[in-house]
């Protein structure tokens, strides 16, 4: 960053999107700012306009191509700059040499569905979205189940240490409403972080069979 009160953080979704957030104390909300991407070994440059997301932070997505196109590799370095307009001039507010596969955050898993539900268990599957083929099977997942009377923050995390796009939830209560979420993370990358949580999937366990007299 150009000065100590500025923070510029970007993540690559592994395909064709770099999402950036820039925070700057004392910056004006109505200032026009751009993130400028300059790859070291590609023939394209890309910009996106930073839009305010809070009092002192701005965000935008560098869309590098169609969602599933592989626009960068592990050897790419992209110079990312925050440029803000000051009158008729543009001033560089922050800069970083961005290594995309060291700063990964995938898209949230999608297409969650109940494969099979019983009284005490439920089998759920999902799909990963816009994830690079470079990862092969080197992904891990975290999942959580929301039980009645609890919050998401209280839900214990279940870890899947392999590329497994399903889970069998057990020891559930019959005839009870639950919600389920999952997130994904590549094993690669020093600054890689978890994807956002998926949209919650609501499901209900089957009622217990009535006992015979």
């Amino acid at each position: 960053a150009v000065n100590g009160t500025s923070r510029f953080t970007c993540f690559y979704n592994s395909r064709a999107n770099i999402s950036c957030v820039w925070s700057q104390d004392g910056a004006l909300q109505d200032t026009s700012c751009q993130v400028h991407a300059w790859p070291d070994r590609r023939r394209w440059n890309q910009t996106c306009e930073l839009l305010p997301v809070s009092q002192a932070s701005w965000a935008c997505n560098l869309i590098l191509g169609t969602p599933d196109s592989q626009k960068l590799t592990a050897v790419d370095i992209v110079t990312l700059r925050v440029m803000c307009r000051e009158g008729v001039r543009w001033r560089m507010m922050a800069i970083q040499d961005f290594k995309p596969f060291e700063n990964l955050r995938l898209m949230a898993p999608i297409s969650l569905q109940v494969v099979h539900v019983e009284t005490h268990r439920c089998n759920i599957s999902w799909k990963i979205s816009q994830a690079s083929h470079y990862f092969e099977r080197h992904l891990e997942f975290e999942a959580r189940t929301l039980s009645p009377g609890h919050t998401w923050e209280e839900a214990p995390l279940m870890t899947l240490k392999q590329k497994q796009e399903w889970i069998c939830l057990e020891t559930l209560t019959p005839d009870t409403q639950y919600e389920f979420q999952v997130r994904v993370k590549p094993l690669q990358g020093e600054f890689t972080t978890w994807s956002p949580w998926s949209q919650p999937l609501a499901f209900r366990t089957k009622p217990a069979a009535l006992g015979k007299d």
Partner: nanobody, 123 residues
Framework: QVQLVESGGGLVQAGGSLRLSCAVS????????MAWFRQAPGKEREFVAS????????DYVHSVKGRFTVSRDNAKNTVYLQMNNLKPEDTAVYYC????????????????WGQGTQVTVSS
């Protein structure tokens, strides 16, 4: 590669209005800063207006400020130029331009271009 098709040009009297449209296909529209340029007979192509990927920020050549409005509809992959209070000196072929780099949009050789639409303003 992105393709641009302009429409909406025509003959109008001084003081009248026209709305130009530029339909974009072949790539992700929101990647692009979009601009309008114009070229009058015997003159060089000149920048008229631009709009950022989000549509939040616009820029105009001084001679059209207050009369022209550039906008975009990211759902329809279209950029517009609303031209009011037209003057005879606005007569030109109007071109739509696209560039993934905001800082290159005024550079003639860096842009992708449409085929142009003729605007004629009679006095």
């Amino acid at each position: 590669q992105v393709q641009l098709v302009e429409s909406g040009g025509g003959l109008v009297q001084a003081g009248g209005s026209l709305r130009l449209s530029c339909a974009v296909s072949g790539d992700v529209f929101v990647r692009y800063t979009m601009a309008w340029f114009r070229q009058a007979p015997g003159k060089e192509r000149e920048f008229v207006a631009s709009v950022t990927d989000s549509g939040r920020t616009t820029d105009y050549v001084h001679s059209v400020k207050g009369r022209f409005t550039v906008s975009r509809d990211n759902a329809k992959n279209t950029v517009y130029l609303q031209m009011n209070n037209l003057k005879p000196e606005d007569t030109a072929v109007y071109y739509c331009a696209a560039n993934t780099d905001y800082f290159q949009i005024k550079s003639l050789d860096a842009n992708t271009w449409g085929q142009g639409t003729q605007v004629t303003v009679s006095s």
